[in-house]
């Protein structure tokens, strides 16, 4: 275990005893709780890879940047960071990497500058529809959150409910209408297979949207029309086979977007012509020269952009591994 | 048939600089991605970096960054790769390959030998 | 650069023989390995693709499985033609590396 941080140190680290002596009353200026780190002129709290069971109850009044990562939190109940007074300067949360496996409803309530929120790396088998608007009025208090990065929360097979991943978490993010003012969304690395096609729709000051490592195999039904901020997308390592004309035309309508496509099993066959078309007019693809077929194996490792009508015929067979992704 | 040529065996001088050249035949040259593979006995297979030929697009492993340099002539189907300041650590097998994703058809390799 | 460990080092076989090589990638890659044959004095070869494909015109007596972290190369019954070095290869991210090789020998 580390020893408290020497005084010489921006960061200071109270003795167990009086965290544990106090704990029930409101926090001190310069108190800072067992098995953390603080610095009140950097506005910050780590209580960071400790093995926490549970959110410190007594964290100073000043925190605006805290640190939860590396623990053992698996539950955040309502109210997990409601305070008295409150902490009304918390801007950034980062909870990665805390074994977290379920948050309720309300869990992030009486957060007013909440901006940041990171809950990456935690198999999360129960998020509350509610867990980020609070209440399940059909229209919320606005969320002041603006980043929201849930990257890789997809729990082990054998401990999903018995419903859609992707259900799950889509309708934490709509329910309530609380997340309209979010312009950073991330879900790479979540085995997502489908995009719920509503869920875009109700994001509109979406400016980062990063979907990728995930297996999503078509945008057919995705709109991004909408999404007239948007700046970037992520689509790198998905089980994309092909774009078709309606995605094709609302990426190129969007002003400022980036649009990165690598590593996909790009089929080459006749369904494949309009977005080679397509590449070879826009800028909107970042690096688009090192996308390249995957299918059939006759065109295999062929640059997309450098294909023709002639090249991209339909033939029926596929390898029994594309079938069935 | 698809098929990468790659030119002969050299002996180097430390210091010294020399040039690879590897002609394709067989498919489009300016539609796939030409790899540069370096093999030395005890340390496997290392990928230094790929060119396409028709945009002249490069990318390098880091570790091979200064030490070797891509060009392609697409009037005769020919990738080359040079390499500078040469040492003995650069004694090895060096493929040339089309590919990306892995790496479909491979040349027959030139073994560069650097002594004094 | 993700690490590709690739076990055993050698492979003493006999003629028929079902052999078993494995990659582990130092992280996840999804399916995107490939499996190279290197037979004494010639350029690597390639046999599988996505971890799984055989490229048309390879025996199906070689076969390849596994995805994210964990691959497999089989083949089924050892001919004597299959003595060689063989490779695994990720290029789910730059720069693509390789596996050290396994040597299949004679008993």
């Known amino acids: 275990s580390s020893s408290p941080t020497s005084s010489a140190s921006s960061f200071s680290s109270s003795a167990p005893f009086l965290a544990s002596a106090v704990s029930a009353q409101p926090p001190l200026p310069d108190q800072c709780p067992a098995l953390c780190e603080c610095s009140e002129a950097a506005r910050t709290v780590k209580c960071v890879n400790r093995n926490l069971t549970e959110v410190p109850t007594d964290l100073p009044a000043y925190v605006r940047n805290l640190f939860l990562t590396g623990n053992q939190l698996a539950v955040l109940p309502a109210g997990a960071f409601a305070r008295r007074p409150p902490l009304a300067e918390l801007a950034a949360l980062n909870l990665s990497g805390s074994r977290l496996d379920e948050v309720r409803a309300g869990a992030f309530e009486h957060l007013p500058s909440l901006r940041q929120l990171d809950l990456s790396h935690n198999p999360l088998a129960d998020l509350s529809p509610f867990a980020f608007s609070g209440s399940n009025a059909s229209v919320s208090a606005p969320s002041p959150l603006v980043e929201l990065i849930l990257n890789h929360i997809v729990p082990p097979e054998d401990e999903r409910q018995n419903r859609s991943f992707e259900g799950m978490v889509v309708a934490a993010l709509l329910a309530g209408r609380a997340l309209q003012g979010l312009r950073r969304l991330e879900l790479a690395s979540n085995h997502f297979l489908y995009l719920p096609r509503d869920v875009l729709a109700q994001l509109p000051s979406l400016r980062h949207l990063d979907l990728s490592n995930n297996s999503l195999v078509s945008l057919t039904y995705v709109s991004f029309r909408n999404l007239t901020h948007l700046e970037s997308l992520h689509l790198e390592d998905n089980a994309l086979k092909v774009l078709h004309n309606g995605t094709l035309a609302e990426l190129q309508g969007l002003p400022h977007i980036r649009v990165f496509l690598d590593n996909n099993p790009w089929v080459c066959d006749c369904h494949m012509a309009d977005m080679v078309t397509w590449l070879k007019e826009t800028e909107v693809v970042q690096g688009k020269d090192r996308l390249t077929c995957a299918y059939p194996e006759k065109m295999r490792n062929r640059v997309l952009l450098e294909l023709n009508s002639a090249d991209l015929d339909c033939d029926p067979i596929l390898p029994p591994s594309l079938q069935t992704s | 048939q698809v098929q990468l040529q790659q030119s002969g065996a050299e002996l180097m001088k430390p210091g010294a600089s020399l040039k690879l050249s590897c002609k394709a035949t067989g498919y489009t040259f300016t539609g796939s991605w030409i790899e540069w593979v370096k093999q030395r006995p005890g340390h496997g297979l290392e990928w230094i970096g790929e060119i396409l030929p028709g945009r002249s697009s490069t990318n390098y492993n880091e570790r091979f960054k200064g030490k070797a340099i891509f060009t392609a002539d697409t009037s005769s189907n020919t990738a080359y790769m040079q390499l500078s300041s040469l040492t003995t650590e650069d004694s090895a097998i060096y493929y040339c390959?089309?590919?990306?994703?892995?790496?479909?058809?491979w040349g027959q390799g030139t073994t560069i030998t650097v002594s004094s | 650069s993700i690490v590709m460990t690739q076990t055993p080092k050698f492979l003493p076989v006999s003629a028929g023989d079902r052999v078993t090589m494995t990659c582990k990638a130092s992280?996840?890659?999804?399916?995107?390995v490939a499996w190279y044959q290197q037979k004494p004095g010639q350029s690597p070869k390639v046999l599988i693709y996505d971890a799984s494909n055989r490229y048309t015109g390879v025996p199906d007596r070689f076969t390849g499985s596994g995805s994210g972290t964990d691959f497999t190369f089989t083949i089924s019954s050892v001919q004597v033609e299959d003595l060689a070095v063989y490779f695994c290869q990720q290029y789910y991210s730059s720069p693509p590396t390789f596996g050290a090789g396994t040597k299949l020998e004679l008993k």
């Open positions: 992280q996840s890659v999804g399916n995107n």
């Open positions: 390959a089309r590919g990306r994703r892995d790496f479909d058809y």
